[in-house]
Interface confidence: low
């Protein structure tokens, strides 16, 4: 049998193989040693007995999508039946005081690989070590500590395989420089020692994507925006656009990236070298945001030709229907047509090619509450003798849309521990003046937090207020008014940010 017969559900066309050579991998046309690594088909009854106490599940993940030329990493983790774990020596043991189907476990071995192997098994060059081989009969590597590696992992993709010894986890990275853009399948089969052979314990496969377009995400945030995920933002307040490029292997670290923004509101094209940008919409309506990300990456040199035209200076147009925008946080990968780019070995070439990424979103701009501030704080005259509570009148004003709801929260002086919260619908006049009367239980310093909200926005301001003791001459004092940044830093007096 050949590797492709044993591993390959995904048959890989011969004409594609020459374009997709993986360094250090071998062709799945190679022969598979069936004596050392018996082959079981799906449904074979031996699978259920291949592991003591249940089935081992292999979980395969990758950091796909990968831009052509970058590295993509695959990680396989083995999930053992309940109450089983791998110990420091690579043996599989039962966890102490864990209840499985057999009852409460003590710290007993499930598989004691190292104790079961006499040292002769591990010596090189003897007939007894002939079983310490991979399925293609290559001998195991012998780095320090290798005896603790109890599992053989066989990775298979693009008509090639890679063999690896490992413990309960294995990691493989491949460089995508010669690969064709498009979705591919990685399959992994995991074997465990069984006497002088290796039997399969788990099989897993996963789709990964190689793309010739830069995978781009954009997060959009705005002060006072009530719901960050609905793509509805407020007029006359800056929106912060932050571009995240999916580049886990840091392929683009040395490349200058340019960002071309069209906000769809006829403000023109903005070109920036910074991944964050602020933009303020001044009209209500629905707008189409378009971002093109461009960079030059190491790439194949064109074949020498006297009539080679210069490369185009404008980016290729994105296809008509790009994939999802922010609301589903997945990268904006465009269909690529899966063109095969024939790349020579470029290790000693210095050519660069342009790569583009696209993001688009349709955002709705509405009127919202832009700002809220406390205009006045007044002590409410109380009859004598004074009651325990002090009453205060706060006059709050806002800019922008008319609020539908007002909330006041009275907290400790750090503004961390809320003592009292009241929300109520409000009817405000066109000037957006709102009078709020609140009671304070005893003297001391309080943080008073006001939020005014409507369907789309929520604006906040806070003030520290000092309630005097019962001395009739002691004055009411507003200590200061401040806002919060996300980290609760207090800003200067009379700044009103959410």
């Amino acid at each position: 049998k050949r590797f492709r017969d044993v591993l390959g559900h995904e048959q890989y066309p011969d004409h594609m193989r020459e374009h997709n050579q993986l360094r250090g991998w071998s062709s799945d046309e190679n022969e598979w040693d069936e004596h050392l690594y018996p082959v079981w088909r799906r449904g074979d009854g031996r699978w259920k007995d291949s592991w003591e106490g249940g089935r081992v599940q292999a979980v395969l993940t990758s950091d796909s999508p990968a831009l052509v030329g970058s590295n993509i990493t695959f990680v396989v983790n083995l999930v053992f039946p309940r109450c089983q774990k791998e110990d420091a020596n690579g043996n599989i043991v039962y966890e102490k005081n864990c209840r499985n189907d057999l009852g409460l476990t003590s710290d007993l071995h499930v598989y004691n690989w190292t104790a079961g192997a006499d040292d002769g098994d591990w010596e090189d060059g003897t007939s007894r070590s002939q079983h310490l081989r991979f399925p293609d009969r290559r001998p195991f590597p012998r780095p320090h500590g290798w005896k603790k590696w109890s599992f053989v992992y066989v990775f298979h993709t693009l008509g090639q395989y890679f063999q690896k010894l490992g413990r309960c986890s294995a990691r493989v990275s491949i460089n995508t420089v010669n690969l064709t853009a498009g979705p591919q399948v990685m399959e992994v089969t995991v074997f465990r020692r069984y006497g002088r052979a290796y039997i399969p314990i788990s099989k897993v496969k996963d789709v990964y994507v190689i793309t010739d377009q830069i995978p781009v995400f954009v997060t959009m945030s705005q002060k006072n925006d009530r719901n960050l995920s609905d793509e509805i933002f407020l007029r006359d307040l800056p929106i912060v656009f932050d571009v995240l490029i999916h580049d886990p292997s840091h392929f683009l670290n040395d490349s200058a990236i340019s960002y071309k923004w069209n906000f769809g509101d006829n403000t023109g094209l903005f070109v920036s070298n910074n991944h964050t940008l602020n933009h303020t919409y001044v009209l209500n309506g629905t707008f189409n945001l378009n971002l093109t990300v461009q960079t030059a990456v190491p790439g194949p040199c064109p074949p020498p030709s006297p009539s080679t035209p210069p490369p185009p200076s404008t980016p290729p147009s994105p296809p008509p229907s790009p994939l999802p925008t922010l609301s589903t946080p997945s990268p904006s990968l465009m269909p690529t047509g899966y063109k095969s780019m024939e790349l020579s070995d470029i290790s000693n070439e210095n050519c660069r090619i342009n790569r583009y990424g696209y993001f688009r979103a349709t955002i709705t701009i509405v009127e919202g509450i832009l700002e809220v501030s406390i205009m006045q704080i007044a002590d409410v005259p109380m009859p004598t003798p004074q009651p325990a509570n002090s009453l205060m009148d706060f006059t709050v004003t806002c800019k922008g849309a008319t609020p539908m709801e007002a909330c006041t929260i009275i907290s400790d002086p750090t503004c961390q521990i809320a003592q009292n919260r009241v929300c109520s619908p409000v009817a405000v006049d066109g000037l957006c003046l709102l009078s709020v009367r609140r009671a304070f239980n005893g003297s001391g310093t309080y943080c008073v937090n006001f939020t005014l909200g409507d369907d789309a926005s929520l604006a906040l301001t806070s003030t520290l207020i000092s309630i005097p003791g019962k001395d009739p001459d002691s004055p009411l004092r507003a200590v200061n008014e401040f806002d919060y940044k996300d980290d609760d830093d207090k800003l200067e007096h009379h700044h009103h940010h959410h």
Epitope: E231, N266, T286, P319, P320, S321, T325, S327, I363, T364
Partner: antibody, heavy 119, light 107 residues
Framework: QVQLQQSGAELVRPGTSVKVSCKAS????????IEWVKQRPGQGLEWIGV????????NYIEKFKGKATLTADKSSSTAYMQLSSLTSDDSAVYFC????????????WGQGTLVTVSA | EIQMTQSPSSMSASLGDRITITCQAT??????LNWYQQKPGKPPSFLIY???ELAEGVPSRFSGSGSGSDFSLTISNLESEDFADYYC?????????FGGGTKLEIK
């Protein structure tokens, strides 16, 4: 390819309502605006409003506020326009349309739905 | 809202002629204007976008010009299938507005 398929002709009584549908196919429905346009017999084109199917956001021209209500159902990739309190002035062909790649105007159009208001 | 004044409202011409239709906006709309052709019983079809760019599949005898508030559509060497209604549309801001239309008839 991009297609917008509208519902069939409607004959309705004055004072009632009608709901015209526009089923989109061949592209990601949430990523493009759907616009609605009115054309009375022998007359010009009149923009009614627009909906963003991704967020449900709408924008109407003043004269159609209260007359037209635009909605979208992402699960069926269908946009709807409901016209209420119908009068003979509402008798017209109604088109839905979708922008080109950068949503510059209307590159793709539905075939039109004729609404006739008559007693 | 932006008003679009299109002229003439109707005109007649002969095969092979060169004709020009104009559209004027009540404010600066940069180049955010499209032109459409419509034949009886059919939806409009996309001719020109961003004032000067030919839509896909449109013959090169159609051309657009202008920016700011004055725009024109020119058809050179008229052919029989060009006799139809023509509309301009501003997409500079909401609400979008169409010109009143021009009926091009054969002389």
């Amino acid at each position: 390819q991009v297609q917008l398929q509208q519902s069939g002709a409607e004959l309705v009584r004055p004072g009632t309502s009608v709901k015209v549908s526009c089923k989109a196919s061949g592209y990601a429905f949430s990523n493009h605006l759907i616009e609605w346009v009115k054309q009375r017999p022998g007359q010009g084109l009149e923009w009614i409003g627009v909906i963003n199917p991704g967020s449900g956001g709408t924008n109407y021209i003043e004269k159609f506020k209260g007359k037209a209500t635009l909605t979208a159902d992402k699960s069926s990739s269908t946009a709807y326009m409901q016209l209420s309190s119908l009068t003979s002035d509402d008798s017209a062909v109604y088109f839905c349309a979708r922008g080109a790649n950068w949503d510059v105007g209307f590159a793709y159009w539905g075939q039109g739905t004729l609404v006739t208001v008559s007693a | 809202e932006i008003q679009m004044t299109q002229s003439p409202s109707s005109m007649s011409a002969s095969l092979g002629d060169r004709i020009t239709i104009t559209c004027q906006a009540t404010q600066d709309i940069v180049k955010n204007l499209n032109w459409y052709q419509q034949k009886p019983g059919k939806p409009p079809s996309f001719l020109i976008y961003y004032a000067t760019e030919l839509a896909e599949g449109v013959p090169s005898r159609f051309s657009g010009s202008g920016s700011g508030s004055d725009f024109s559509l020119t058809i050179s060497n008229l052919e029989s299938e060009d006799f139809a209604d023509y509309y301009c549309l501003q997409f500079h801001e909401f609400p979008r507005t169409f010109g009143g239309g021009t009926k091009l008839e054969i002389k």
